[in-house]
């Protein structure tokens, strides 16, 4: 699956109206300078691929963000505004039902959410040249 056929403006609106606020809430109590992230993505489909990777998959030090409010709203936005996206999620949803773990916010998860904030900001400014 690639994100080429998504309605990017509708996804951007969903981000600005709600997902961004949930990301800020998750990060509350951390300084904006605490994580020195140089994440980037080259265009809107690529940004969404990276957002998909970091929102719904484990990474080193952060087992899962998929149950967080921003993640559920991200999934909803992609399901609504990206044709065919929902069909890619069947196995992942079933696997998630099997793994109901206690939520623990680790420093590594905060770092990962900081990376997500950078990706979303880049998604919202697609015409900016890469640094």
């Amino acid at each position: 699956y690639d994100f080429t056929n998504c309605d990017f403006e509708k996804i951007k609106a969903a981000y600005l109206s709600t997902i961004s606020k949930d990301l800020i809430t998750y990060m509350s109590g951390t300084k904006s300078t605490e994580f020195n992230n140089t994440v980037s993505c080259s265009n809107r489909p690529h940004c969404l691929t990276e957002i998909q990777s970091l929102t719904f998959n484990p990474t080193a030090g952060c087992a899962s963000l998929a149950k967080e409010m921003f993640a559920m709203k991200t999934k909803a936005a992609l399901a609504i505004w990206c044709p065919g996206y929902s069909e890619t999620q069947i196995n992942a949803t079933q696997a998630m039902k099997k793994r109901r773990k206690r939520k623990v916010t680790t420093n590594k998860c905060l770092e990962q959410v900081s990376q997500l904030q950078g990706l979303w900001r880049r998604f919202n400014r697609p015409l900016l040249k890469q640094q």
């Epitope: 994440v39 990276e50 990777s53």
Partner: nanobody, 117 residues
Framework: DVQLVESGGGVVQPGGSLRLSCAAS????????LYWYRQAPGKQRELIAS???????NYVDSVKGRFTISRDNSKNTLYLQMNSLRPEDTALYYC???????????WGQGTLVTVSS
Amino acid sequence: DVQLVESGGGVVQPGGSLRLSCAASGSGFGVNILYWYRQAPGKQRELIASITSGGITNYVDSVKGRFTISRDNSKNTLYLQMNSLRPEDTALYYCASRNIFDGTTEWGQGTLVTVSS
């Protein structure tokens, strides 16, 4: 599906370096999120480094600053550069490739790293 084969393990002295490789065949490698795991004797397998298709990396604290994960999508290969190795890095190292949409994960067979003087 992706098939994975690791190489580059061996015996090294404390403070030394090794570079592990993980060669992939099959489809899907390009957009998958890739991992290096390790399993030390008598311990559980742990995820130590991850990299997205666009090169965003994450590390556990025990290897951060010493290990570097990278990928070459044109060669379908994942790497782990390991510097300043310590005896506690002795383990079987596995690469893994996870479909970012449905979560299906393919594993390599592992390559053994022994850090000993």
